[in-house]
């Protein structure tokens, strides 16, 4: 990215890191940002299967505020698809169009899972959607195909992976995993009392970790899942970020991102501690602790800042 | 339109067992991952339980008491709740995938 940015921007540090988690497509979803815009990106997904999308593959434009991930991101399809309109902002929960309902925890990978969701969804007149018929829809999903982009340059038939076959998990699996991988359900305290949060580690939380894939039971015609909990480990874990491609095909700037959340993560220890059950009496003891490390950092900030308000010739890129 | 109404919630005594209904409408049910979060007064929204066809996670701090299905016939995703503690107050919301939400439904635990 030819662009200079502020790399000390919440938004571009953010957009930085996302981008090369997406780097590499899977067979669902892809998404990139623009060579000379960091807050302009290209996605392409796939219609959902088992709906009147199913062998589509649509690709648009989400344009992302300064403000990112304080504010949500605006998405346009490119590709006639017979659900959202073309170059037109659309209205989902998670778009510009729904700041009220946006949260900081959400991304870009939720963005294009909750597009992938939407899609067999009916429109209900929201600006934006479009009610076609289940054929013409069908026509568009076949015609997607063809299409290329002339602001990125990608040819449909050729920017996911190829569908697996077989052993594919339904499209409510592939979204519940993402779901559960994707959102921070706690900030971690590490063996050495600093906080992990979503921004530091964007796999880390805590959750027990059942199987992947457990058996549905049926109950004559009704597919009613149930799952009982007594036999899972009670453990939770740190999932390590995914691995990114090659550094040779990243800018400068993404690989010193990446170089240095790859320094702070090996700094932190490969387990996150579970919560362990503790007695009232060491409750108060590790209170006082947790309150003498947030007194120490936020005076450790206050320092920084007022170090950076002195040194500012020295800011340069890292 | 996507709607999504839970139910169940209420009064219940340390120890006690709920079991709370989120009935579904307005998109296709067995193709969506479902959700159950909650936020308790003066907290965050916490995620608790995600359940997609045969794939379920947890939150640690309700591992081993509570369990989450679904019954795709009736569009209906349950969030079962035992040996309830003080500390389970909230508001409970079911979600569509993390974007779509239903209004809440309280749930006390009090002696």
């Known amino acids: 990215m030819e662009t200079r940015y502020n790399l000390k921007s919440p938004a571009v540090k953010r957009l930085m890191k996302e981008a090369a988690e997406l780097k590499d497509p899977t067979d669902h979803y892809h998404a990139q940002p623009l060579e000379d815009n960091l807050f302009e990106w290209h996605f392409t997904v796939r219609g959902p299967p088992d709906s009147d999308f199913d062998g589509g593959v649509y690709h648009g434009r989400i344009v992302l505020p300064p403000e990112y991930p304080m504010k949500p991101p605006s998405i346009i399809l490119l590709t006639a698809n017979g659900r959202f309109e073309v170059g037109k902002k659309i209205c989902l929960s998670i778009s510009g169009h729904h700041p009220e309902t946006w949260q900081p925890s959400w991304s870009i990978r939720t963005a294009l899972l909750a597009i992938i969701g939407f899609m067999p969804t009916k429109g209900e007149g929201a600006i934006g959607s479009l009610d076609y018929t289940p054929e013409e829809r069908r026509a568009l999903a076949k015609k997607s195909q063809d299409f290329c982009c002339e602001g990125c340059g990608s040819a449909m038939k050729d920017v996911l992976l190829p569908l697996k076959s077989g052993s594919d998990s339904s499209q409510a699996d592939q979204e519940a995993k993402e779901l559960a991988r994707q959102i921070s359900f706690k900030a971690e305290v590490n063996s050495s009392g600093k906080t992990i949060s979503e921004s530091d580690l964007n796999h880390s939380f805590s959750l027990t970790d059942l199987q992947d894939d457990i058996p549905t039971t049926f109950q004559g015609a009704t597919a009613s899942t149930s799952y009982g909990l007594q036999n899972s480990s009670a453990a939770s874990f740190h999932q390590p970020t995914q691995p990114v491609a090659k550094n040779t095909s990243m800018s400068p700037r993404q690989r010193r991102a990446q170089q240095q959340s790859q320094r702070r993560l090996s700094t932190s220890p490969d387990v996150i501690q579970g919560h362990q059950p503790r007695d009232n009496h060491t409750d108060h003891g590790g209170s006082a602790v947790l309150i003498v490390i947030l007194t120490l950092a936020l005076a450790a900030l206050i320092f920084r800042r007022i170090y950076l308000a002195n040194e500012y010739i020295f800011d340069f890129e890292l | 339109q996507v709607q999504l109404q839970e139910s169940g919630g209420g009064l219940v005594q340390p120890g006690g067992s709920l079991r709370l209904s989120c009935a579904a409408s307005g998109f296709v049910f067995e193709n969506s991952a479902m959700a159950w979060y909650r936020q308790a007064p003066g907290k965050e929204r916490e995620l608790i339980a995600v359940i997609g066809t045969t794939f379920i996670k947890l939150a640690e701090s309700v591992k081993g008491r509570f369990t989450i299905s679904r019954d795709n016939a009736k569009s209906t995703v349950y969030l079962q709740m035992n040996n309830l503690k003080p500390e389970d107050t909230a508001v409970y919301y079911c979600?569509?995938?993390?974007?779509?939400w239903g209004q809440g439904t309280q749930v006390t635990v009090s002696s």
């Open positions: 979600s569509k995938s993390g974007a779509y």
